[in-house]
């Protein structure tokens, strides 16, 4: 027998649907109406036929009471080819819901998103996460999506983006955005970061995550942040192959005094990089290739320094490698 596509936990909290049949029974998803966190995986299906079954231009207010009764607070939609018009229709309807967090993953968005009608209400999300989402509209996708959201977005995460750079002139400011995560875009690089950090569009950023984004030096990142006017309190550069030395011809970069936490773990560093901020509350240099203890003059003034998992701390080990097991408090790097 075929397993049920949707499973609701016994507390009406989590509901997961995996639609893998070529002709899925979408009505099975109705058992998720009482769930708080809902995940719908569409098995790579093309949702184009849906457009024939729904009126994407219908006034969503007619569904307002039905949608308000949904308990869903967090929704994940994955693995499908979605016409932009259908996505917009869904966003318009969900604007009447209690939805706070939306995750889109492994989606191919086809066609262009229509402009927001004057009478339409934007979706009041606090968090939007995108992973491996491709858009037919190229660089203007963020601006097109943004118009369907209210301006209170606090967390934006964009991973495995096909176009991590945005059409900055079309993007409006994100006044409430405190966390921006561009991790897992290995092709981004420092130039791409400059293009992605649209100047003065992210005025409230406190946390910036750039794990595995092809960054090369902390100084290069500093320059990109300075150019964009972005002053995070916390910066995560872990899982990048960082160079410790700075190009002598590159201008010196002054880090923002707002920065108090810097993560440089898993960065392949053989020495403490030059050009770090003068003062930090937290500096994580764990799981690098430091063969000797850093000298005080190599380090910023720092309250909380993590050096676990470096060769100089582990007697008799060579460079740390994936899956190595270390004793005591030393993490497996």
């Amino acid at each position: 027998t075929t397993p049920e596509p949707c499973e609701l936990d016994d507390e009406d909290f989590r509901c997961v649907c995996n639609f893998s049949e070529p002709q899925p029974d979408w009505s099975e998803a109705f058992q998720c109406v009482s769930a708080v966190e809902v995940e719908i995986h569409a098995g790579g299906l093309n949702l184009e036929p849906f457009l024939k079954r729904v009126d994407a231009d219908a006034d969503p207010r007619q569904y307002a009471d039905t949608v308000k009764a949904l308990r869903v607070r967090r929704l994940t939609v994955g693995a499908a080819q979605v016409p932009a018009q259908l996505l917009v229709g869904a966003l318009r309807v969900l604007a009447y819901s209690r939805l706070k967090e939306l995750t889109l993953e492994d989606l191919k968005i086809t066609g262009t998103m229509p402009p927001l009608p004057l009478e339409a209400t934007g979706l009041a999300l606090s968090s939007l996460r995108l992973r491996n989402v491709s858009w037919a509209t190229g660089r203007s996708w963020l601006a097109e999506l943004q118009q369907w959201l209210k301006p209170g977005l606090k967390v934006l995460s964009i991973a495995q983006a096909h176009s991590p750079a945005f059409s900055c002139e079309q993007v409006r400011a994100f006044p409430a955005l405190t966390s921006l995560d561009l991790s897992d875009n290995p092709g981004l690089g420092e130039r791409g970061l400059m293009a992605a950090l649209c100047p003065h569009k992210f005025p409230a950023i406190q946390n910036l995550a750039l794990r595995n984004t092809g960054m090369e030096t902390p100084t290069g990142v500093c320059a990109a942040l300075a150019a964009a006017g972005v002053q995070p309190h916390s910066l995560d550069l872990s899982h990048n192959s960082l160079r410790a030395t700075v190009n002598p011809s590159a201008p010196r970069c002054m880090w923002s005094s707002a920065l108090n936490s810097l993560n440089l773990s898993f960065a392949g560093l053989e020495q403490v990089p030059k050009g770090l901020p003068a003062k930090l509350r937290v500096l994580d240099l764990s799981c690098n290739r430091l063969n000797r203890a850093p000298q005080p003059d190599e380090l910023p003034e720092v309250d909380n320094l993590t050096l676990d998992g470096n060769p100089f701390l582990v007697p008799g080990t060579a460079l740390p490698h994936e899956g190595s097991m270390n004793s005591g408090v030393v993490p497996a790097c």
Partner: antibody
Framework: QVQLQESGPGLVKPSQTLSLTCTVS?????????WNWIRQPPGKGLEWIGY???????SYNPSLKSRVTISRDTSKNQFSLKLSSVTAADTAVYYC????????WGQGTLVTVSS | DIQLTQSPSSLSASVGDRVTITCRAS??????????LHWYQQKPGKAPKLLIY???NLQSGVPSRFSGSGSRTDFTLTISSLQPEDVATYYC?????????FGQGTKLEIK
């Protein structure tokens, strides 16, 4: 059978940060459900503080939101509460609880805010 | 926020009596076919214990003399035949919408 156990200091000074940890046994906090903090001032009723879900998503009571952080350590199967800028009004028994119909409770820990 | 108002605030009844506690919500706590209203019993110095979930479902291990009913905004907890061990404070709670809220409690004593 899921079991929850609160731990942390029983006395916190005014204006400081209250920190509590809940250790969960018999169930993984990443498999499903919401993992809540609820408090009860002496002789008073119950107040929901907030939760962290299996996915890491958080939801807080708006009356406390500016002072509350709930986080988790999945490697230890623990979740934690931090409540900043405490006053005497934050003196209460603090419970960690699983789910949104609160079927599984820790035994509670009394935190007194006093200088 | 959804306010829950319990009545009475306290009551005294004799062993064997049928006892009813009501809980009124400031707005509906229903989501489609379910009412997200639950009932708890708390004895002094102990954590609350879930008695009834989703308005009318008896939690495993709870004696069958406890029952719940109601929908939308009006709910009732009934003890069909009061026992000495039922002396406690009873709370209703809604989980339809955050912030999740409790009633102020009903203190039940034996005459």
């Amino acid at each position: 059978q899921v079991q929850l156990q609160e731990s942390g200091p029983g006395l916190v000074k005014p204006s400081q940060t209250l920190s509590l940890t809940c250790t969960v046994s018999g169930y993984s906090i990443t498999s499903d459900s919401a993992w809540n903090w609820i408090r009860q001032p002496p002789g008073k009723g119950l107040e929901w503080i907030g939760y962290i879900s299996y996915s890491g998503s958080t939801s807080y009571n708006p009356s406390l939101k500016s002072r509350v952080t709930i986080s988790r350590d999945t490697s230890k199967n623990q979740f934690s509460l931090k409540l900043s800028s405490v006053t005497a009004a934050d003196t209460a028994v603090y419970y960690c609880v699983r789910g949104l119909r609160f079927a599984y409770w820790g035994q509670g820990t009394l935190v007194t805010v006093s200088s | 926020d959804i306010q829950l108002t319990q009545s009475p605030s306290s009551l005294s009844a004799s062993v064997g009596d049928r006892v009813t506690i009501t809980c009124r919500a400031s707005e509906s706590v229903d989501s489609y076919v379910n009412s997200f209203l639950h009932w708890y019993q708390q004895k002094p110095g102990k954590a609350p214990k879930l008695l009834i979930y989703r308005a009318s479902n008896l939690q495993s291990g709870v004696p069958s003399r406890f029952s719940g009913s109601g929908s939308r905004t009006d709910f009732t907890l009934t003890i069909s035949s009061l026992q000495p061990e039922d002396v406690a404070t009873y709370y209703c709670q809604q989980s339809n919408e955050d912030p999740y809220t409790f009633g102020q409690g009903t203190k039940l004593e034996i005459k």
